[in-house]
Amino acid sequence: SETTTGTSSNSSQSTSNSGLAPNPTNATTK
């Protein structure tokens, strides 16, 4: 198996959950 390391994408030291809806629902079919 392989191991890889990712470095910080952004300079803050906390992960921001702000890009995702807090209580998401499934997309509706139109």
Epitope: S8, S14, T15, S16, N17, A27
Partner: antibody, heavy 115, light 112 residues
Framework: EVKFEESGGGLVQPGGSIKLSCAAS????????MDWVRQSPEKGLEWVAE??????????YYAESVKGRFTISRDDSKSRVYLQMNNLRTEDTGIYYC??????WGQGTSVTVSS | DIVMTQTPLSLSVTIGQPASISCKSS???????????LNWLQQRPGQSPKRLIY???KLDPGIPDRFSGSGSETDFTLKISRVEAEDLGIYYC?????????FGGGTKLEIK
């Protein structure tokens, strides 16, 4: 420094299983919503699964294509998130990224499903 | 699933000149809390993606202010006011309003 270190990728036969692991450091892991996203030339970036934090009761979400085959889990005491992948198909081939709610990303680990 | 359509597929820009990328979603991304969960990611050659912008226009920490995002509902735009050499790569829009989260097909930015 924030680091996401993924491991567990490799070559597996169709129908086989593999478990990916992602170790986070330098970030308050317990409050992070953790996702696995895969990338392939055929499908581009494709979200796979997500597990939320304790305040969200560790709720999990899955892409339809992996439901019933993949299981996401986490161990906050070890700052790790896992992806158990069973009954693998050739279309599961790709680079699998561990990401904190699309904010921080690891460098990816390659999974190849082939006979 | 929400379909995210990006245009153009690729663009070639001279250093110092502006660049603009469009992203259209198949449904409105406005969430019930009034926020719109539209993200922009950058993937440089040989690297993993990194988020530049979340909630349409909010810059992530450490992202240069030459990047900006705008739009609402189904139409969104990423703008680079003055392209630099380090900006080359592929840019993706991604929606986090509805499950499953979905990504655009990407726009490749090349430097002239």
């Amino acid at each position: 420094e924030v680091k996401f270190e993924e491991s567990g990728g490799g070559l597996v036969q169709p129908g086989g299983s593999i478990k990916l692991s992602c170790a986070a450091s330098g970030v308050p892991f317990s409050g992070a919503w953790m996702d696995w996203v895969r990338q392939s030339p055929e499908k581009g970036l494709e979200w796979v699964a997500e597990i939320r934090d304790k305040t969200k009761n560790y709720v999990t979400y899955y892409a339809e294509s992996v439901k019933g085959r993949f299981t996401i889990s986490r161990d906050d005491s070890k700052s790790r998130v896992y992806l158990q992948m069973n009954n693998l198909r050739t279309e599961d081939t790709g680079i699998y990224y561990c990401t904190g709610a699309m904010d921080y990303w690891g460098q990816g680990t390659s999974v190849t499903v082939s006979s | 699933d929400i379909v995210m359509t990006q245009t153009p597929l690729s663009l070639s820009v001279t250093i110092g000149q502006p660049a603009s990328i469009s992203c259209k979603s198949s449904q409105s991304l406005l969430y019930s809390n009034g926020k719109t969960y539209l993200n922009w990611l950058q993937q440089r050659p040989g690297q993993s993606p990194k988020r530049l912008i979340y909630q349409v226009s909010k810059l992530d920490p450490g992202i240069p202010d030459r990047f900006s995002g705008s739009g609402s509902e189904t139409d969104f735009t990423l703008k680079i006011s003055r392209v630099e050499a380090e900006d080359l790569g592929i840019y993706y829009c991604m929606q986090g309003t509805y499950l499953p989260w979905t990504f655009g097909g990407g726009t490749k930015l090349e430097i002239k």
